[in-house]
Amino acid sequence: LPGVGLTPSAAQTARQHPKMHLAHSTLKPAAHLIGDPSKQNSLLWRANTDRAFLQDGFSLSNNSLLVPTSGIYFVYSQVVFSGKAYSPKATSSPLYLAHEVQLFSSQYPFHVPLLSSQKMVYPGLQEPWLHSMYHGAAFQLTQGDQLSTHTDGIPHLVLSPSTVFFGAFAL
Amino acid sequence: LPGVGLTPSAAQTARQHPKMHLAHSTLKPAAHLIGDPSKQNSLLWRANTDRAFLQDGFSLSNNSLLVPTSGIYFVYSQVVFSGKAYSPKATSSPLYLAHEVQLFSSQYPFHVPLLSSQKMVYPGLQEPWLHSMYHGAAFQLTQGDQLSTHTDGIPHLVLSPSTVFFGAFAL
Amino acid sequence: LPGVGLTPSAAQTARQHPKMHLAHSTLKPAAHLIGDPSKQNSLLWRANTDRAFLQDGFSLSNNSLLVPTSGIYFVYSQVVFSGKAYSPKATSSPLYLAHEVQLFSSQYPFHVPLLSSQKMVYPGLQEPWLHSMYHGAAFQLTQGDQLSTHTDGIPHLVLSPSTVFFGAFAL
């Protein structure tokens, strides 16, 4: 029977995409999360909306992705920042924008940066600005590892499903 | 017989890359398209030149990639923009640059943005400029879905095989 | 029979790249290299430290990645550049920053650019700057091909495992 012997999320996937009557050996954990646009001053990841999903064992816990099984994963994330011109009366201070994917593992007592991108923005008079950051790479991860993000400049995020996202898939 | 029942491009690929004595279950649809450098004021995707290719069912239709089979795909694209300094006589107007990968599906009556990157550029006197945008992510797609791009700032594209491209592969 | 039941392009692929007749059918070549932070004015790739690795046949040769078996690979790289404000006594000259992944194969008497990103930076007074570049795409590669990088602006690299990296994995 379709989905028999599959994890619940795999069975659901099998029903949605009947292409994949997969033996357990061919399960392909994958996740794509989007930033919750209703939370303007924080970056909360969601998997239950729009094009976001969790497949074959990935789960969300405390705004982190939990690695379902040990192996090599491609991990990626994007953010887009924007801002208005500063007012002539205000002084223009430089803005440090950064986005990082971090690993928290029982092997280490701290968050290890996996992917980091950074930018200095100097807002000008009458000059709205926009900046995009993307990164992704392959990492050897262990079951139970936690993947999270840290962002400097959250109030400037352009929160939409196509601009701010975070994901991973097993190779 | 080798090539029996294969599409012509698949048969050709098989001859070129004899590495894959693969059963159907291991077909790996993949595509990498490059912007046609002979078309300066439009962005036309090509798969029959340089390092570009369509493999295992991907095809091009109306400048869109057609998804060959339902499943999860990693979709990516890059553009590079450039411009000259504005002339002292001209007024410098800000340039909005953007690049988006869109999904057109029978499920929706409109193009859904999957990946978006944006930038505001303020050309200065004697200041040529260059800007790169890249993005990619995993999406659940359905057979027959159309993946296309929309770009603001096409006249400024640096059209070469290594700077402007669009691709996808099945996970 | 090899290729029977495949689409034509698949049959062609099967003849060209006769793939992995090994218990190796499950081998997944992958590599992730990081820029050596102890080498400040060059970009030397390392795979034996931090989160870097070579798996299932990838190997290093003269600062290049050697492709372990013919097939399609996703190849990616990132760099982050930074700089200080120029001194008021110095003249500010524009900085050309670029990062390229190149393919060297004796088919061609030169390195073929696969992925290129570029940026012009205009350092200002009291204005430190930061810039990130990322790119990645799928390419048909042949066993023994050499993947390397070329960077303009090496003295400005922010060399850390999460900011400067280069990798590839078989699809």
Epitope: - | P18 | Q16, T69, S70, Q107
Partner: antibody, heavy 118, light 107 residues
Framework: EVQLVESGGGLVQPGGSLRLSCAAS????????IHWVRQAPGKGLEWVGY????????NYNEKFKGRATISSDKSKNTAYLQMNSLRAEDTAVYYC???????????WGQGTLVTVSS | DIQMTQSPSSLSASVGDRVTITCRAS??????VAWYQQKPGKAPKLQIY???HRYTGVPSRFSGSGSGTDFTLTISSLQPEDFATYYC?????????FGQGTKVEIK
């Protein structure tokens, strides 16, 4: 069945040259590189370099660069090792090998002995 | 170049014995090590790749382990056909280098 057969070994004068052949069968010749590895009498193994018949790509051990040339002829399913300026320490059994993944020498020929002596 | 140092250079053992051969790399090589078996007058045969993966057709009594700089080939119960010389090889970076060999002889 993959088969590699070397030929061309024998006695060579110091300063002379050799051209070894490696005839391959049992697989698609252009799908894998051919390595050359040598072994001096009673000694260990030493990688010389490889050639990819598909695109004529090569990679050499720096030790042999300039003295060794590895090539192939697709029409004959044969790879070649040319070595010049031979010296006594080049006396060895020379093997050609086909990998699975690039750096793993999975299939070997029987070897051909080259003796450099006056 | 990376140096691969094998120990011991030779050992004597009996059928049924557990045999361990070690190989040390002069720098960290991740898990990029292979092991080969060679009998007199014959070409080497690939036994283990990627430090711990048995090549097709290699009996399960052969196992490999290690990462970084220290690697081990173990034969859990030596058989008559296992008497040979064993070489480790690093596949981390060119020029790929081999250890000097360990000769396993009959006691």
């Amino acid at each position: 069945e993959v088969q590699l057969v070397e030929s061309g070994g024998g006695l060579v004068q110091p300063g002379g040259s050799l051209r070894l052949s490696c005839a391959a069968s049992g697989y698609t010749f252009t799908s894998y590189v051919i390595h050359w590895v040598r072994q001096a009498p009673g000694k260990g193994l030493e990688w010389v370099g490889y050639n990819n018949p598909y695109n004529d790509g090569t990679n050499y051990n720096e030790k042999f660069k300039g003295r060794a040339t590895i090539s192939s002829d697709k029409s004959k399913n044969t790879a070649y090792l040319q070595m010049n300026s031979l010296r006594a320490e080049d006396t060895a059994v020379y093997y050609c090998s086909r990998p699975t993944m690039l750096p793993w020498f999975a299939y070997w020929g029987q070897g051909t002995l080259v003796t450099v002596s006056s | 170049d990376i140096q691969m140092t094998q120990s011991p250079s030779s050992l004597s053992a009996s059928v049924g014995d557990r045999v361990t051969i070690t190989c040390r790399a002069s720098q960290a090589v991740s898990s990029a090590v292979a092991w080969y078996q060679q009998k007199p007058g014959k070409a080497p045969k690939l036994q283990i790749y990627s430090a711990s993966h048995r090549y097709t057709g290699v009996p399960s009594r052969f196992s490999g382990s290690g990462s970084g700089t220290d690697f081990t080939l173990t034969i859990s119960s030596l058989q008559p056909e296992d008497f040979a010389t064993y070489y480790c090889q690093e596949s981390y970076s060119t020029p790929w280098t081999f250890g000097q060999g360990t000769k396993v002889e009959i006691k």
